[in-house]
Structures are given as C-alpha cells and as structure tokens.
C-alpha cells in the first residue's frame, strides 16, 4: 500500500528556458491521500524564500496526479530566478527542489525560431 | 493507452550524425518528461537525457557536447541527434515516458536497434 | 553519479522458491523525501517493464509474487514465488538525482 504522506515532486536542479511576452505555467506536482494540503509558491531571494501572496495559482488534477500550479500571464523578464512550493500537512512544512525559469526578453528572441519551430522545420 | 514508437536507422557509418524519433500517442509531450536510454550489446542500460513538458532539456553530462533532444508539439513527437557517432554507439535506443511522482519510466517505446559500422 | 551495484549478476532459482536480488547505492537516494529507487524487468527482445516504483511500490498489472523494499543505500526486489515466466533480467534505477542509472542487471534463470 502506498505511503500517505505528502510529496512534492519538483525536479532536482529543473530548468525552464522561457520568452517574456509568453504565457507559461510551472508545475509543482503534489501526492496526497484524503486531505489536499494548502501549497504556497515562493521565489528565492538569496537564502531566503520570498511568498508569493498575490500571484494566480490554480489546482490542476490530470490522470491522478495533481499539479499546483503557479502562472505566469505574461511572462515578464523579472519573472527569471528560482522558485520553490512548498505544502503544509498536519503541521509539517514539507519543500521541494528548487526550480530555475531563466526568462528571454522578447526583444532579443525575435530574431530567433524557437525550440519547437526548428524542430519542426528540421523534421518537416 | 500510452505508447511510444522509436523510429531511425538500424545502421550509421562513424562519423556520421545519428537522428531517431519518438511518437506519442495517448498522452500530450507537453505534459511530464520524456526520456532517451540505451542498452548495449553487454546489457548496460545508460540514460541519454530527457525534453521536459515545458521544452527544456538535460543530457548525461557523458554526452553533452555529441547530444540534442527536440521535439514537435504538433505531431506529439520528440527527436534524438547524437553526433559523430562511433561503433561504441552500437545499441538499441529506447524512448521513456517519466511518471511525475517520482520519473520512473513507466511507458517505453520497443527500441529500435543501431548499428554503426563502415 | 550514483553508482547502483546489482548482485548476485545471475541468479538460478527453483519453481516456487524465493529469488532475492539486491541493489547498493554509492549515495544515500532519500532527497525526495521518499525513495526514488524503482527496479524493471528486461525480457529478450522487450523494452524494460516497470514492476516497482518508489522502492515499494507495486505498478499496476504486476503480480503480488514481486515485492520491493529498502531505503537509503539497499534495496531489494524479491520474487516469491518464482515462476517460470519470470525468466529475465532485473535492473535497478534511481532517480533521485541526474544523470539516472541503473544498476548492472540481475539474469534470473529457473534451476
């Protein structure tokens, strides 16, 4: 039988390349059994973790998994750094793995196909 | 149901660039992490890297200057390049699926063999 | 990288006996909080099939025969009680840090 107890499953050293302008969510994905804990975002400032009050989160729940997720509408260029969740259980503060946005200004990304376009083109 | 199917040459010449496919079907590339492996002729199994549902990759520090790992949202595919291969490359290549809670790979594609020879 | 090693390499077992394989880490693979420590079987000619997640954690579909157990550096796949379809090699895998890797396979033959 699985264990109960809360998990959040951010990737160890995870990384997302992403555009300012775009719109993009991260995923923390969080295991629980019967009671959904409360899960904050926060982003690192230093050694300390700075919450992110008045950000849009949202629950998603996909194939039993569930996913908080923290958006970003539109991606801003102080959006880059790091970022943690982190879930209050039964008085238990459990934090994940910290993970890195590194954010592209528009401006200098215009000139350049993304990812997905070279792919795509290459494979055509 | 998930499944993946590898696609590529069974045989590249040394030298030469390596470019296998990966087809998705029964879930979004855009969500979890997808995974390359290799075994080789002695049963080693290595992993190679993965493309993440945002687009952003890791490779084996092992591979990392010979390796890239795309992949296009549109036809839920997601491709291998492995450069300058030599017969050291023999293997047959596996593409993976990682489960969120906890990356173990829980759909793999049936491999697809390499041989690379003159 | 963390270093899994398999023992035994092969392993001959009776029908209806116990087959026990183990697997040492060279670091401790708890960051998670848990054990990302998951072990697969390799039939001739088949890709890789996930028995265990998690250190002990049965997937779905697979029989209660396999059982998975262990933290921190050993771990251990125990199939009870063998069957002659069970013929494979057994690998080990972490993920609890990048690169992932496996261990070196176990081959379990029926005696």
């Known amino acids: 039988k699985e264990s109960c107890d809360v998990q959040l499953y951010i990737k160890r050293q995870s990384e997302h390349s992403i555009l300012a302008g775009d719109r993009f969510e991260l995923e923390c994905p969080v295991k629980y059994c019967a009671n959904r804990p409360h899960v904050t975002w926060c982003k690192l400032n230093g050694t300390t973790c700075v919450k992110l009050e008045d950000r849009q989160t949202s629950w998603k729940e996909e194939k039993n998994i569930s996913f908080f997720i923290l958006h970003f509408e539109p991606v801003l260029p102080n959006d880059n750094g790091s970022y943690r969740c982190s879930a209050n259980f039964q008085s238990n503060l459990i934090e994940s793995h910290s993970t890195t946005l590194y954010v592209t200004d528009v401006k200098s990304a215009s000139e350049r196909p993304s990812k997905d376009e070279m792919a795509s083109r290459f494979w055509a | 149901e998930v499944q993946l199917q590898e696609s590529g040459p069974s045989l590249v010449k040394p030298s030469q660039t390596l470019s296998l496919t990966c087809s998705v079907t029964?879930?979004?590339?855009?969500?979890?992490?997808w995974n390359w492996i290799r075994k080789f002729p002695g049963n080693k199994l290595e992993y190679m890297g993965y493309?993440?549902?945002?687009?952003?990759?890791y490779f084996n520090p092992s591979l990392k200057s010979r390796i890239s790992i795309t992949r296009n949202t549109s036809k839920n595919q997601y491709y291998l390049q492995l450069n300058s291969v030599t017969t050291e490359d023999t293997a047959t290549y596996y593409c993976?699926?990682?489960?969120?809670?906890?990356?173990?790979?829980?759909?793999w594609g049936h491999g697809t063999t390499l041989t690379v020879s003159s | 990288d963390i270093v899994l090693t398999q023992s035994p390499a092969s392993l001959a077992v009776s029908l209806g006996q116990r087959a026990t394989i183990s697997c040492r880490a060279s670091?401790?693979?708890?960051?998670?909080?848990?054990?990302?420590m998951h072990w697969y079987q390799q039939k001739a000619g088949q890709p890789p099939k996930l028995l265990i997640y998690?250190?002990?954690n049965l997937e779905s579909g697979i029989p209660a025969r396999f059982s998975g157990s262990g933290s921190r550096t050993d771990f251990t796949l125990t199939i009870n009680p063998v069957e002659a379809d069970d013929v494979a090699t057994y690998y080990c895998?972490?993920?609890?840090?990048?690169?992932?890797?496996f261990g070196g396979g176990t081959k379990l033959e029926i005696k």
């Open positions: 895998q972490q993920t609890d840090e990048d690169p992932y890797t």
């Open positions: 029964g879930d979004s590339i855009t969500s979890a992490y």
């Open positions: 493309i993440s549902y945002s687009g952003s990759t």
């Open positions: 670091e401790t693979i708890d960051s998670y909080g848990d054990s990302l």
């Open positions: 998690r250190a002990s």
């Open positions: 993976a699926r990682s489960h969120y809670y906890g990356y173990y790979f829980d759909y």
